[in-house]
Amino acid sequence: EVEKTACPSGKKAREIDESLIFYKKWELEACVDAALLATQMDRVNAIPFTYEQLDVLKHKLDELYPQGYPESVIQHLGYLFLKMSPEDIRKWNVTSLETLKALLEVNKGHEMSPQVATLIDRFVKGRGQLDKDTLDTLTAFYPGYLCSLSPEELSSVPPSSIWAVRPQDLDTCDPRQLDVLYPKARLAFQNMNGSEYFVKIQSFLGGAPTEDLKALSQQNVSMDLATFMKLRTDAVLPLTVAEVQKLLGPHVEGLKAEERHRPVRDWILRQRQDDLDTLGLGLQGGIPNGYLVLDLSMQEALS
């Protein structure tokens, strides 16, 4: 029997082609030159190598590139990408958006894995910021990507990139993330007219301060209840009944169904019952008539 470290006569690979699929693991190891593999990586993707053979190919590339694969190899990894560990990926320097897309395509339809998260992290750090094209690509593959970033990471998103964000991309963002994204969105959409501006800014309003909500209430925006319920409680509390009525327009009737939930519940507690009664919705829990409200937080700030 041929010693398993030597390539059998006539089996030395001259090129990467489909005949290699029928090589045993040890034959593939012995008969395929790593440099040949690296220069013909574009063919690897087109050949349905077996599960075990992919391990052999990875081993060959690891030996050839102990410091990390070059981008010319990375771009053509295909299913081999799914054999990589985050530690492998940390050695890479991925700069081409095409490379990123090619690798994300391999994992398409699946949740973001540690490998993909590491790849994205390496790519974004290499670019220095999350530019529009990158954000476009990432949110296309992973709608929840933006909300997986920390507020610190989000601070590197330039306002111009906000145009790529779709409402569903913000579904899982928490208030801290929206606090960072809202000012960027406000800046990005500042030259739009009233109704168009509201359509674009609506998804980001969970980060809006009171003064911006007051300004919106003057613009007949008819905010829906779902958006209102996502507003910051501290931003909603100072709004008057008249301002909330203007902000919600015909949707104001929805307040009744939400009166036990924040921020509506807390807002009701801050309003005069007389004012709440003007809405005709039967909202209860406001400040009874004749009571004086002292804002102790303001007093503490002054002393």
């Epitope: 299913y79 699946h110 894995s113 540690p114 993909v116």
Partner: nanobody, 119 residues
Framework: QVQLVESGGGLVQAGGSLRLSCAAS????????MYWYRQAPGKERELVAF???????NVRDSVKGRFSVSRDSAKNIVYLQMNSLKPEDTAVYYC?????????????WGQGTQVTVSS
């Protein structure tokens, strides 16, 4: 997950034919390529044939002209048609595939079906 079940094996005389079936269930939409392997007593397991999702097929040199592989995509079944069988084709035949899941590749095997070719 993917479940693979082979059937169709048996005892056949040299020169005879058999058709093996591999029925796949579970996450079949993720399957790209299906493989047929065999393992003869005391020998290494070897790849016999494969069929990709695009329908391209290939068989190893020693069975070329005798074995062919096909699939019924609607039923998620892959077939290995074996003609002009020889005693050296005696082995346990296995169906195999792998799929991407959770950021990595997962390998799946059937339980195997015995093919015995008598002279």
């Amino acid at each position: 997950q993917v479940q693979l079940v082979e059937s169709g094996g048996g005892l056949v005389q040299a020169g005879g034919s058999l058709r093996l079936s591999c029925a796949a269930s579970g996450s079949t939409s993720s399957i790209n390529t299906m493989y047929w392997y065999r393992q003869a007593p005391g020998k290494e397991r070897e790849l016999v044939a494969f069929i990709s999702s695009g329908g391209s097929t290939n068989v190893r040199d020693s069975v070329k002209g005798r074995f062919s592989v096909s699939r019924d995509s609607a039923k998620n079944i892959v077939y290995l048609q074996m003609n002009s069988l020889k005693p050296e084709d005696t082995a346990v035949y296995y169906c195999n595939t792998y799929i991407p899941y959770g950021g990595t590749l997962h390998d799946f095997w059937g339980q195997g079906t015995q093919v015995t070719v008598s002279s």
